[in-house]
Structure formats: C-alpha cells, structure tokens
C-alpha cells in the first residue's frame, strides 16, 4: 500500500501592529507538536493596511471596520478554514495611541472599542486590543530577534543557519525606530541597571537574562521631525523656515495647528504671528545634524551615564539588530551593508541631502513625494540618535546590523508578543526526547 501524506498538524496566530503611521497584520505558523521548541514559529504573511495609523481615526471611528477589511480578508484566505476558530488574533497599539491616550483616555478607548467590534466580526479567536507599553515594545522586539537568530537554543552548531550568527549564545541588542517612539534594549555586561524602570528580568529556556530597555516617546522619526520644526519655527524671523534637513528647492506649507496637534511639540509651543509657514529646503547635512542634536538634552544626568533627557543608559555591549524604520530608511539610502563604515554613511548622507529636490524627484520617480522628501531628515536623525543619543562610535558602528527580516520573519515586536501571549517561550528548557511520538506514522 502507498504511504499517504498525513495532514500537517500546524497552528496559526495573527498579530496586528497598530503603529503611529500605519497598521500591519502578521500571520505566524508553527508545528503544533513543537510549540515549546525555539525557532519553529515563522511568519507566513505580512499585510500592510492601507491608510494611516488607528489614532488618526479618532474623529471617524466608524471607518475603522472598512480600514481593516482587506488585511483581515487576506488572513481568511491564507489560514485554512478548519483553523479559523482556533487562530488567536491580538492587536497591539504603540506610541501613536500612547500619545492619543495622553491627550484623552476616553478617545483612545473609543478607538480600541471600535477595533474590537470590527475584529470580532471575523471567524478567528479575537483575544484583545490594547496599547502596549514602551517597555513591552522594547522587550518583545529583543525577544523576536534573538528567537529568530537562534540565541535561545541550547544546541551549539558548527554551521551557521542564520545571518549574523556568531555561533555563541550572546544575545543581540535590539534597536527599534518607529514613527512616534524609539526603543533600545540589550543585556549589559556585568553592569547594574541603575534605574529600576529600565530593568527587565527574564527566564527563557532555562537561562536568566537581565535586560536593559528604554522607549523614548516622541523620538520616533515622525514625531522627532515635528519637534524639530516646532523648535526651529520659534526663532524664525517670519513665516519662512529655511530648513537644512530638506533638499535644496523643496517647498512645503505647514499649518501651525498641525504642528501643535501632538503632545510632542508642547514644550516648544508659542503664539506665532501666522497660521501657516513654508519650509524651504537648503539641504545641508551638518546643519541638519546640529539642529537635531538640540532635541537631545545631554546637560543633565542623575546616573553614571545617560543617553539623553536624563535617561540612564549602560555602556553598549555586543552586537545590535536595528530594525523597523532604522532598516527601511537605511535600505532606501542603500546604507545597510555591513561593509559601510560610519564615516562612509555620513559622507553619503552629506551628498544625498545636498542633491536638489528636482533631481531627487527624477531619480526616485516611483516613490511618494511625502516619503521621499523626508529621507534626508530621517537618515540624519538615525545617525544623530545612534551616535550622540546612544553613544555608538565609528568603531562600534560595525556592531550595528540593519535587519529587515530574519529567516523570512520581520524583525519587530509582534512575534515576541505572540510567543509570550500564547505561552510559547517556556521559562525552563523543555526536556528533549530522542524521538517525539509524532515521529511514528
């Protein structure tokens, strides 16, 4: 008799990352009998929801259902119907919703209420929608990249199956850049974490980890740009802002009401004698860098060492994975190669920012102007944040690995979140049996 293929015994999970600028839906898959093994969960789909982040729906919450439809229907197609009822769905909202909650807890709850109502209409097993903390965002990002890099596996291998693998069990640090916040998370070397708020203790697969993490709210790339504009318009002599962070020849009108809409610009708010101003790009990396540095208060530190704004940061240790906008921006600028030194990155940024806007538009005809116009700022901001904010140096730059995906799964907090909420990261090392019963047919 011929051997019949057994139906694969797999499970699925869905996580929606409700970020400040957009929402993405991730579908994960894993073998049911290997739930506690490390490295078995992988991403099978990413669906980017068309439109802005959910916090922008605060005045039109009735549109959230339509907004989520395409990606939820995609999930319905990808996941076999027999698995729908068993598939958990989680939604985690990050700094965009943290900012909305700071303005109004009621409005933030209204958005999440409508999200739940919308997601409960699908055949999946909806588990909850919530605003995750900055600490969680950092921690889950760290768990994701180390899980995917095989750092929690006790088996040492003589061959490398993943990029960046140094065949030791030393974990990677995680650098995450979003639109509204940025996170830094790593295991410091024998260093006391001086501020309790930044300390996390994990026991994963039988090993203890003392992890440092901090999330800088308002220091994501979009909110940092709003901060910079609010700071610079204070000293503008009229309604023209000559801005070194935009290409020469670039022009854009900004409403003052939009500028002061976010809590991130409150510290720079003042009564201006105009309702609008015009950004005129002058494309100068050095001046842009200097302007960005003014967003980081380094004059005050109540600890042995700080990042900025009086936040404790231990000495950097080991290799780091830089993902999300760190990766997207550097990838666009073609600066993700391991061979590119920090000096070379700076040189390339100087050239890029100095290129005239008309030339840039021609060179990148397929890219939306809104995004295209901001790469000079974003690239400069990334350099400023990593070098002056987090104290990377020209030498330690080579320890930063700009990572989009690891083994087909996106680097980011969502996988770590799902692993935790589905209890798929055991505290103790699972007992390994020579052959699991599933081996026998």
């Amino acid at each position: 008799t011929q051997n019949k293929a057994l139906p694969e015994n797999v499970k699925y999970g869905i996580v929606l990352d409700a970020g400040s600028s957009h929402t993405s839906l991730y579908i994960y898959k894993w073998p049911a009998e290997k739930e506690n093994d490390t490295g078995v969960v992988h991403q099978v789909e990413e669906c980017r929801v068309k439109g802005p982040g959910i916090s922008k729906f605060v005045q039109k919450v009735n549109e959230i259902g339509i907004y989520l439809t395409d990606c939820m229907e995609r999930a319905r197609e990808v996941i076999p119907r027999s698995q729908h009822q068993e598939t958990p769905v989680y939604l985690g909202a990050t700094a965009g919703m943290r900012l909305l909650r700071m303005e109004s807890e009621e409005l933030a709850d209204r958005v999440l209420d409508v999200v739940e109502r919308s997601l409960s209409n699908y055949p999946f097993d909806f588990q909850g929608a919530r605003i995750i903390t900055g600490q969680e965002e950092g921690a889950y990002g760290w768990i994701t990249i180390n899980y995917l890099l095989g750092k929690f596996s006790q088996k040492t291998r003589w061959f490398s199956i993943v990029p960046y693998e140094t065949n030791n069990q030393e974990t990677f640090g995680a650098l995450d850049l979003g639109g509204a916040s940025t996170q830094v998370t790593f295991v410091p070397q024998n260093q006391t974490i001086e501020s309790p708020d930044n300390a996390l203790q994990f026991r994963l697969y039988g090993k203890d980890y003392n992890v440092y993490t901090h999330s800088f709210l308002c220091y994501g790339k979009d909110q940092a740009l709003w901060q910079k504009l609010a700071k610079d318009i204070q000293v503008a002599s009229n309604e023209i802002l000559r801005d070194p962070c935009f290409h020469p020849g670039y022009k854009k009108v900004v409403n003052v009401s939009d500028l002061y809409k976010t809590p991130c610009t409150k510290r720079f708010e003042m009564t201006l004698p105009f309702q609008q101003f015009e950004i005129q790009g002058i494309g100068n990396y050095q001046q842009c860098h200097q302007s960005i540095l003014e967003l980081f208060n380094t004059s005050y530190c109540p600890y042995s060492q700080c990042a900025f704004n009086g936040i404790f940061l231990p000495p950097l240790q080991g290799d780091f994975g830089a993902f999300s906008a760190f990766y997207f921006v550097m990838k666009f600028l073609n600066l993700t190669s391991e061979k590119v030194s920090q000096e070379k990155v700076t040189e390339m940024m100087k050239k890029f920012c100095a290129q005239p806007w008309e030339e840039i538009k021609t060179s990148y005809a397929g890219v939306k102007e809104k995004y295209l116009s901001e790469y000079c700022f974003s690239g400069t901001y990334i350099l400023s944040l990593l070098l002056q904010g987090y104290h990377f140096t020209a030498d330690s730059w080579e320890h930063i690995h700009f990572i989009g995906k690891i083994q087909g799964s996106d680097a980011g907090w969502t996988l770590g979140y799902m692993l935790n909420l589905t209890n798929m990261i055991p505290a103790e090392q699972p007992l390994s049996t020579p052959l699991s019963h599933s081996t026998y047919v």
Epitope: D113, R117, D125, F126, Q127, G128, A129, R130
Partner: nanobody, 126 residues
Framework: EVQLLESGGGLVQPGGSLRLSCTVS????????MGWFRQAPGQERDFVTA????????HYADSVKGRFTISRDNSKNTVYLQMNSLKPEDTAVYYC???????????????????WGQGTQVTVSS
C-alpha cells in the same frame, strides 16, 4: 495582578431575579475578558458566561442562555451578571473571573491564566 470583589448574591425564590457585580482593582480593565463561573456543592466549577474587553463578544453556557445576561461598564471597572427566571439548579457559589488578553471562548474552555474572585453564594429556594 488584578483583584476581584463580587457582590449581589443572596436568597431568591424560583422565577426571581438577581444581579451580581464584580469590581476589579489594579490593571487596565479593558485588557481583561471577564467571566462568571459557578460551583454547586460537590460539583466542579462550571463556566457560566464571559465577555470580551470592550463587550462585543459574549459566550454563555447552554443552561443559562436566554435567562442570564453578562455586561460590563469599563468606566466603573465592573462586570455584571443579570440572572432572570432563576431555578433551584442555579444554586451555587458564583465566581467572578478575569483573564488578560484572552478571548471569552478560551475562558469558556478554562484555558489561559485566570484570576478568581472569592465567590458569592446564590441560593434559589422557595
């Protein structure tokens, strides 16, 4: 961890009504699915009903469908169980339950990590 405090139990005649309340302290209330379970003397603890964080998903045990209604008021951190057409077989200790980022369906299966209240006695007798 969240703490749960039930109230509203008591003695009621068959066919009567009762409303149980459960107030939650600590934690972000909307992040928890809430439920009610009951345990009659000498029996196991049974699922009665559960509701999702913002109240859009509910599940009921077949034995109470159409008679019991679960609801929640997130502004008061409170979940309610309205019990109508009570029968002697509804007599039990009723326990409030909270489960973080867990669906009502999983609560029904008693899956995941559940935090329990102390329980309140409901007696249906003439």
């Amino acid at each position: 961890e969240v703490q749960l405090l039930e109230s509203g139990g008591g003695l009621v005649q068959p066919g009567g009504s009762l409303r149980l309340s459960c107030t939650v302290s600590r934690g972000t209330f909307s992040e928890y699915s809430m439920g009610w379970f009951r345990q009659a003397p000498g029996q196991e603890r049974d699922f009665v009903t559960a509701i999702s964080g913002f109240g859009h998903i509910t599940h009921y045990a077949d034995s109470v469908k159409g008679r019991f209604t679960i609801s929640r008021d997130n502004s008061k951190n409170t979940v309610y169980l309205q019990m109508n057409s009570l029968k002697p077989e509804d007599t039990a200790v009723y326990y409030c339950a909270a489960a973080w980022q867990t669906s009502p369906r999983r609560m029904m299966q008693m899956a995941g990590s559940i935090t329990w209240g102390q329980g309140t006695q409901v007696t249906v007798s003439s």
